[in-house]
Interface confidence: low
């Protein structure tokens, strides 16, 4: 196979957040992030190769304690395909409850043209620290 | 490609811990752990092949309940490059808050000679159960 | 190498659960789940190729809040080899404490014929939402 398509993204939001959608970025200005195959469009990741992908994400809430997290509950993170509309689906969802970090991963088939969106519902802001909040994909097989 | 460099490590510290650095081990005496490419030096993992790696870690606190975890807060785990000093950086960081286990993963470029260190700050001890605490890397592409 | 053996499974239990063992399923009727190499036998995953595998799992408790989770503590998830009996071992274990989701992953050697079981101890039920509860494996190398 050619080198597998991969991406590791850092948060690139401007605050205060006007909508629940997290915007991602990559490149030297954003730590050790990169895109190698997939592309960023307005802060969302667009897939350029069909196949099975491993998605992973970690999001840490800024200025957060167990008390903050539970008081602002429910704070939920969801990763899904947001376009094309015909393929719209939630792929991964986690709530923070009394914690300030969620992290997970999964294998899922994605198609060329799928755009991935990550939504953080609730009033808390995500941390932009490069070791606390990140989102990545890795092509695994056709 | 040749077989990808991989490692899955188990905790190998002696306690009480004098410093926050966790020491890892591998081999038949430590469950199903191994190093295949990277090497252990004084309990830290040294990379022997440039490339993009998937890091993953799970750490469970010993003798821990939600109450213990919150009373000993902040207990934080950080994984980073600790040498060479010129490349020192935190790659992955999580706090326990009211939980007793953290688990995460990420993609990050590493270079031959990079040594990875894992620091657990706080007074709680990590569990050395082989199914509760482990740290691993997998080479993904150049 | 040929395409790596992979599987991504969804929960296929019928409730109320009579025993702590979670039963998994795959295929079009269960979201974006599939088996590609390994096979399902009575809801458990059977490995058909020796090698190093990456296991990952996320389990979310249904009708759960921090209060529920702590009141029903301990709720624990364990993933292990349950047959053949001679290779029986716990590979991955997490407790929920005051959270309602656990997620983790690890690298572990598996052999052809190993059957993986996932046990959820406690009285709470897992969510069957396809973006909240899933279990997968990916062959990494021989």
């Amino acid at each position: 196979h050619p080198e597998p398509h991969t991406a590791e993204l850092q948060l690139n939001l401007t605050v205060p957040r006007k909508d629940p959608t997290l915007r991602w970025g990559a490149g030297p200005a954003l730590g050790r992030s990169f895109t190698h195959g997939p592309e960023l469009e307005e802060g969302h990741l667009r897939i350029h190769q069909d196949g099975l992908y491993r998605l992973h994400i970690q999001v840490t809430l800024a200025i957060c304690s167990s008390t903050t997290a539970s008081r602002h509950h429910p704070t939920t993170l969801a990763v899904g395909i947001c376009s094309p509309a015909s393929r719209s689906i939630s792929l991964l969802r986690l709530s923070f409850h009394q914690g300030c970090t969620i992290a997970s991963q999964r294998l899922t088939p994605l198609a060329r043209g799928d755009t991935l969106c990550t939504n953080l519902t609730g009033t808390l802001l995500p941390s932009r620290n490069t070791d606390e909040t990140f989102f990545g994909v890795q092509w695994v097989r056709p | 490609h040749p077989e990808p460099h991989t490692a899955e490590l188990q905790l190998n510290l002696t306690v009480p811990r004098k410093d926050p650095t966790l020491r890892w081990g591998a081999g038949p005496a430590l469950g199903r752990s191994f190093t295949h490419g990277p090497e252990l030096e004084e309990g830290h993992l040294r990379i022997h092949q440039d490339g993009l790696y998937r890091l993953h870690i799970q750490v469970t606190l010993a003798i821990c309940s939600s109450t213990t975890a919150s009373r000993h807060h902040p207990t934080t785990l950080a994984v980073g490059i600790c040498s060479p000093a010129s490349r020192s950086i935190s790659l992955l960081r999580l706090s326990f808050h009211q939980g007793c286990t953290i688990a995460s993963q990420r993609l990050t470029p590493l270079a031959r000679g990079d040594t990875l260190c894992t620091n657990l700050t706080g007074t709680l001890l990590p569990s050395r159960n082989t199914d509760e605490t482990f740290f691993g890397v997998q080479w993904v592409r150049p | 190498h040929p395409e790596p053996h992979t599987a991504e499974l969804q929960l296929n239990l019928t409730v109320p659960r009579k025993d702590p063992t979670l039963r998994w399923g795959a295929g079009p009727a269960l979201g974006r789940s599939f088996t590609h190499g390994p096979e399902l036998e009575e809801g458990h995953l059977r490995i058909h190729q020796d090698g190093l595998y990456r296991l990952h799992i996320q389990v979310t408790l249904a009708i759960c809040s921090s209060t529920t989770a702590s009141r029903h503590h301990p709720t624990t998830l364990a993933v292990g080899i349950c047959s053949p009996a001679s290779r029986s071992i716990s590979l991955l274990r997490l407790s929920f404490h005051q959270g309602c989701t656990i997620a983790s992953q690890r690298l572990t050697p598996l052999a052809r014929g190993d059957t993986l079981c996932t046990n959820l101890t406690g009285t709470l039920l897992p969510s069957r939402n396809t973006d909240e509860t899933f279990f997968g494996v990916q062959w990494v190398r021989p």
Epitope: - | L13, T14, V15, P16, P28, A29, L30, G31, R32, T60, L61, A62, I63, C64, T68, T123, L125, P126, S127, R128, N129, T130, D131, E132 | A78, G80, S88, I89, S90, R93, N119
Partner: antibody, heavy 122, light 111 residues
Framework: EVQLVESGGGLVQPGGSLRLSCAAS????????MNWVRQAPGKGLEWVSD????????YYADSVKGRFTISRDNSKNSLYLQMNSLRAEDTAVYYC???????????????WGQGTLVTVSS | QAVVTQEPSLTVSPGGTVTLTCGLK?????????PTWYQQTPGQAPRLLIY???TRHSGVPDRFSGSILGNKAALTITGAQADDEAEYFC??????????FGGGTQLTVLG
């Protein structure tokens, strides 16, 4: 219900050997660290040895190091203690004890067998 | 010579309160020693009562409580009952991987 049943004790001469067994039931044996703890007649408790859940890591009290070997067979839900070069001071009731798994840096014994008596005497 | 020290014997009246202590021959006991308490009645195996200084094991009545008192770990029994008559052992975590047990305290419930 957790049950631990020891066997294999008895009278042995100094320098002799004995193998103790512990049959476990009522819990997932392969998840737990297991221990041997002994109690000399009319005395206190002494931790002897532990073995991790997979059987790959073992620790021993200094008093038995090099003479005793702990092992387990997860497929048989069994724990063993091979005792060689026995001395009079090894005379004790030997208990098989499960580590509570809270977790296992600090041995906390939440389930015990009834013990088996080992007498070392000429 | 025992590293972990306990009173050899104590007496309490039914319904009374008694505190057993567990010290180190040299140094203070702290929560980092993870004090653990076991109860043993004649001819029986020990039973776990308290771990991690003050956490009651499941099924242990709430008249048993653990704490650090000064430089020692303590087990307090309030409202003592006849079946609390037993030997009590404390265990301290001193160095990996072992625990050191105290010599035990024989508790007598008078009456």
């Amino acid at each position: 219900e957790v049950q631990l049943v020891e066997s294999g004790g008895g009278l042995v001469q100094p320098g002799g050997s004995l193998r103790l067994s512990c049959a476990a039931s009522g819990f997932t044996f392969s998840v737990y660290y297991m221990n041997w703890v002994r109690q000399a007649p009319g005395k206190g408790l002494e931790w002897v040895s532990d073995i991790n859940n997979e059987g790959g890591t073992t620790y021993y009290a200094d008093s038995v190091k090099g003479r005793f070997t702990i092992s387990r067979d997860n497929s048989k839900n069994s724990l063993y203690l091979q005792m060689n070069s026995l001395r009079a001071e090894d005379t004790a009731v030997y208990y098989c004890a499960r580590d509570a798994g809270y977790s296992n840096h600090v041995p906390i014994f939440d389930s015990w067998g009834q013990g088996t008596l080992v007498t070392v005497s000429s | 010579q025992a590293v972990v020290t306990q009173e050899p014997s104590l007496t309490v009246s039914p319904g009374g309160t008694v505190t057993l202590t567990c010290g180190l021959k040299s140094g203070s006991v702290t929560s980092d020693n993870f004090p653990t308490w076991y109860q043993q009645t004649p001819g029986q195996a020990p039973r776990l009562l308290i771990y991690n200084t003050n956490t009651r094991h499941s099924g242990v009545p709430d008249r048993f409580s653990g704490s650090i008192l000064g430089n020692k770990a303590a087990l307090t029994i309030t409202g003592a009952q006849a079946d609390d008559e037993a030997e009590y052992f404390c265990a301290l975590f001193i160095s990996n991987p072992s625990v050191e047990f105290g010599g035990g305290t024989q508790l007598t419930v008078l009456g």
